[in-house]
């Protein structure tokens, strides 16, 4: 054999005895008839030698060390060559060592071509015998980053101040390339960064530097995980030990690019996060240790990347093919910003395109699935437009405002289902007839059902909110003059069970001038509370609303207003209220901007309450709350 090392190559070759074996016959390196057991060849030297035995691989090993000095001159970055070529070396177990020294301010990155690396723990070995041992440096101290085999996920390792890479190849291995390159990077301000890339499902076991010995005091080490967006990653700690910290304790921090909750801090004993969608970083931060009894910090953990579990891998069909002018949006519920760790939560179309928001439109059948650890983090909002363009065709036509069962079967809570009801201006009006009579939500008698109907004007320039209504009251129908939106809003998951109580029919009716008319048929059992639209903001200027209140034959209705004066101050016009008996047409008119509101009054027959607003001065709005109570006529009312 002849080994010639070029001058200035900074390569040293050492052939030495390997682990002693029980072989009877010793073996020697022979140089010009001299028998030796160790041979060192330095840069610029050329040596010819042989072995005194047939199988030198059973006796000797060869170490080839190249020192790369990035302190005094430029660094030879790029693909690292095996020098001398393996074909020129004796067939011994060989270890190529690259020792790179650099300034603290320079980051060095080892890039591993496919196959990537897999970290192994103490006592483990690589199936093919090829191992990569990587060390870093903190000042003069060598820190073991880890030992790695082929066929893993580790693609890059970034360090600073220096790196020592040892590639061990068994004598029989045909490999003739290093399989990695070195690049320079800006300072990483930590011990090292290990990048782990997952192409698909799989797992990786990784360890803190120096494992199983102690992680260097007060150091920071980061693992960057590259995970396809449609897969989920979970972290579990297999083994850890905690040191004795002075003040700040060791911790792990999770960082998710694009997340608003970065970084989320965990203690090592905490349950670590699972179901993370897409890329994330994990950092281990050591602490200042007690000088008397420092203890040791070490961590071995596993990252499991898999397709989402349970509910998430079902495919749901949302059939909107027979729907018109409808859109369904699945989106994250608004949550108060916090630094709490939040795993990704996605909805996917055709299991391929995943995003945090998804809008499905009418006219198609959609297949969706979820990538989410907790589906209560999502909700659905649906909008459907029912419009009439030709008043001759629409008049008296009815539509049922029901949530389609396809939507109710999705595993995500329905938040709002809004129907936009559009009519030709000054031609038609609308009437809403509930399957079950409605109660108006008031502070005095709040709705406590799992859903309500929110009724508001759908005319952009008009700020008119009729109110929130839920099943179980006395309102038989609501007539409105023009375009409105009716929103079914759910308040509890129990809506799924109560869905049968929903049901509202809208009909297009001849146009009328009042903004709204409420038909009220009170029950003898309870007090009906009613309030003017736009409560708290005041009835809009020059708006008129009426209540048609039915009084059964054998009953008397008591109409009570909840304040002495309306509080409205008119800038122009007059605000007034008319209470009219329907049978006799007898009416009482009250000037709301001047008069005291009427004392409780008793009505033996059905009656109207009409309230018409002026143009009020700001801050002096018209808000009225009143109640209707039925009592049997036999009671002596005096």
């Amino acid at each position: 054999f002849e080994i010639a090392l070029p001058r200035e190559s900074n390569i040293t070759v050492l052939i030495k005895l390997g682990t002693p074996t029980l072989l009877a016959k010793p073996c020697y390196i022979v140089i010009s008839k001299r028998h030796i057991t160790m041979l060192s060849i330095k840069s610029g030297e050329r040596i010819v030698f042989t072995f005194s035995c047939q199988s030198p691989e059973n006796h000797f090993v060869i170490e080839i060390q190249k020192n790369i000095d990035c302190m005094s001159g430029p660094c030879p970055f790029g693909e690292v060559q095996l020098q001398p070529s393996t074909s020129l070396l004796p067939t011994l177990n060989r270890t190529f060592i690259w020792d790179v020294k650099a300034h603290k301010s320079i980051g060095l990155e080892l890039q591993f071509s496919i196959p990537r690396l897999r970290q192994i723990g103490p006592g483990e070995s690589c199936p093919d015998g090829v191992t990569h041992s990587i060390s870093g440096r903190i000042d003069a101290t060598v820190v073991r980053i880890g030992t790695f085999c082929s066929n893993g996920t580790v693609s890059r390792i970034k360090m600073q101040e220096g790196v020592k890479m040892a590639l061990h190849l068994p004598w029989f291995h045909p490999r003739n390339v290093s399989g990695f390159s070195i690049a320079n990077r800006s300072s990483i301000k930590r011990l090292c960064i290990i990048e782990s890339v997952f192409e698909g499902e799989g797992s990786a076991t990784l360890m803190s530097a120096n494992y199983p010995e102690g992680f260097p005091e007060d150091e920071l080490m980061t693992w960057q995980f590259v995970v396809p967006a449609h897969l989920r990653a979970s972290v579990s700690f297999l083994n850890f030990n905690l040191s004795n910290c002075e003040r700040k304790e060791e911790r792990v921090e999770y960082y998710i690019p694009g997340s608003t909750t970065n970084p989320e801090v965990f203690k090592l004993e905490d349950k670590q996060p699972g179901n993370m969608a897409g890329n994330f970083n994990l950092s281990l931060q050591g602490c200042d240790q007690d000088a008397q009894s420092p203890g040791i910090l070490r961590l071995q953990f596993q990252v499991l990347v898999q397709h989402p579990q349970n509910e998430s891998n079902k495919i749901y069909v949302v059939d909107l093919s027979n729907e018109r002018a409808m859109s369904l949006t699945i989106e994250p519920r608004p949550v108060k910003q916090s630094r709490k760790f939040v795993p990704g939560c996605f909805v996917c179309l055709e299991s391929r395109t995943c995003s945090s928001n998804l809008t499905l439109t009418s006219g198609s059948k959609h297949k969706i699935s979820f990538l989410c650890d907790d589906l209560t983090r999502l909700w659905m909002n649906v909008e459907k437009t029912i419009s009439c363009t030709d008043h001759r065709y629409c008049q008296r036509k009815s539509y049922s405002l029901q949530v389609p069962s396809d939507i109710l079967h999705l595993p995500v809570e329905l938040h709002d289902f809004s129907w936009k009801l559009l009519v030709p201006k000054d031609r038609l009006s609308l009437v809403l007839v509930p399957a079950q009579k409605l109660q108006q939500h008031t502070h005095e008698k709040p709705c406590n059902t799992s859903f309500s109907y929110l009724v508001a004007s759908a005319i952009p320039s008009q700020d008119l909110y009729f109110g929130s209504f839920c099943p179980g009251g006395s309102i038989k129908q609501i007539q409105v003059k023009q375009n409105i939106s009716v929103t079914l809003r759910t308040f509890a998951p129990s809506f799924q069970q109560e869905a049968s109580r929903q049901g509202l029919t809208v009909s297009f009716i001849p146009y009328f001038k009042e903004e709204g008319v409420f038909t009220v048929t009170p029950d003898t059992k309870s007090k009906v509370y009613l309030r003017t639209p736009n409560w708290d903001r005041g009835l809009p200027s020059l708006t008129s609303v009426s209540w048609n209140i039915s009084v059964p034959r054998d009953q008397v209705a008591c109409l009570t207003f909840f304040k002495e004066r309306s509080g409205v101050v008119c800038q122009t016009g007059r605000a007034f209220m008319i209470i009219q008996e329907q049978r006799t047409r007898a009416e009482e008119i009250f000037s709301l901007d001047e008069d005291v509101l009427p004392k409780p009054s008793f009505h033996h027959h059905s009656f109207w309450v009409n309230i018409s607003n002026c143009s009020p001065t700001s801050g002096k709005q018209l808000d009225l709350l009143f109640s209707v109570t039925l009592t049997p006529r036999t009671v002596d009312l005096t």
């Epitope: 700040k248 801090v265 004993e269």
Partner: antibody, heavy 121, light 107 residues
Framework: QVQLQQSGPELVSPGESVKISCKGS????????VHWVKQSHSKSLEWIGV????????KYSQNFKDKATMTVDKSSSTAYMELARLTSEDSAIYYC??????????????WGQGTTLTVSS | DIKMTQSPSSIYVSPGERVTITCKAS??????LSWFQQKPGKSPKTLIY???RLVDGVPSRFSGSGSGQDYSLTISSLEYEDMGIYYC?????????FGGGTKLEIK
């Protein structure tokens, strides 16, 4: 169920020492750390220190380094705290509390009923 | 040491009302904060840990929130049995430190 049973009230003279005990039951005693807390009228609640049997870690607040000594007896599942060179300032209720973790890194999930210490001549 | 400033120091509330107590840390404590309740003559009882996680068996009217340096404990609808002193505790670093306490009294 998890319980921390503390020793009874103590009346001691100034300059003396006292040893308060805290017996854990309903869980594996050596798997969890034990904290000690002082409650006095003047300073509300003060953390004295923590003893982790599992990790062999003992930590003291700077204010109690020369005052308190925490020990454990694994065989009887009991934690002890000895308070030395007592003065009237040490009169207070002392609580032991279990750490939610073995290492002392957690929150206090269970508390003892407290031991009232009165230092008076 | 991390200083925990709790407010208000005392509060009078009627049953059924919503109560919020706040705790401010002198530095970021990474949500490593717990809340506990102490009734007169009794030992403390932990209600919340990790800033917002309810301890098993604690009524759901108690909730915690916050991050960084600012945290709060809310009782959504006060009951008579909720009277007592409420404390916060940071367990982000040694030494552990407590808030000064909030005395909750029923009107």
């Amino acid at each position: 169920q998890v319980q921390l049973q503390q020793s009874g009230p103590e009346l001691v003279s100034p300059g003396e020492s006292v040893k308060i005990s805290c017996k854990g039951s309903g869980y594996t005693f050596t798997d969890y750390a034990v904290h000690w807390v002082k409650q006095s009228h003047s300073k509300s609640l003060e953390w004295i220190g923590v003893k982790s049997v599992y990790y062999g870690i003992t930590k003291y607040s700077q204010n109690f380094k020369d005052k308190a000594t925490m020990t454990v007896d694994k065989s009887s599942s009991t934690a002890y705290m000895e308070l030395a060179r007592l003065t009237s300032e040490d009169s207070a209720i002392y609580y032991c509390a279990r750490d939610s973790y073995g290492s002392s890194r957690g929150y206090f999930d269970y508390w003892g009923q407290g031991t009232t210490l009165t230092v008076s001549s | 040491d991390i200083k925990m400033t709790q407010s208000p120091s005392s509060i009078y509330v009627s049953p059924g009302e919503r109560v919020t107590i706040t705790c401010k840390a002198s530095q970021d404590i990474n949500s490593f904060l717990s809340w506990f309740q102490q009734k007169p003559g009794k030992s403390p009882k932990t209600l919340i840990y990790r800033a917002n996680r309810l301890v098993d068996g604690v009524p759901s009217r108690f909730s915690g929130s916050g991050s960084g340096q600012d945290y709060s404990l809310t009782i959504s609808s006060l009951e008579y049995e909720d009277m007592g002193i409420y404390y916060c505790l940071q367990y982000d670093e040694f030494p552990r430190t407590f808030g000064g306490g909030t005395k909750l009294e029923i009107k």
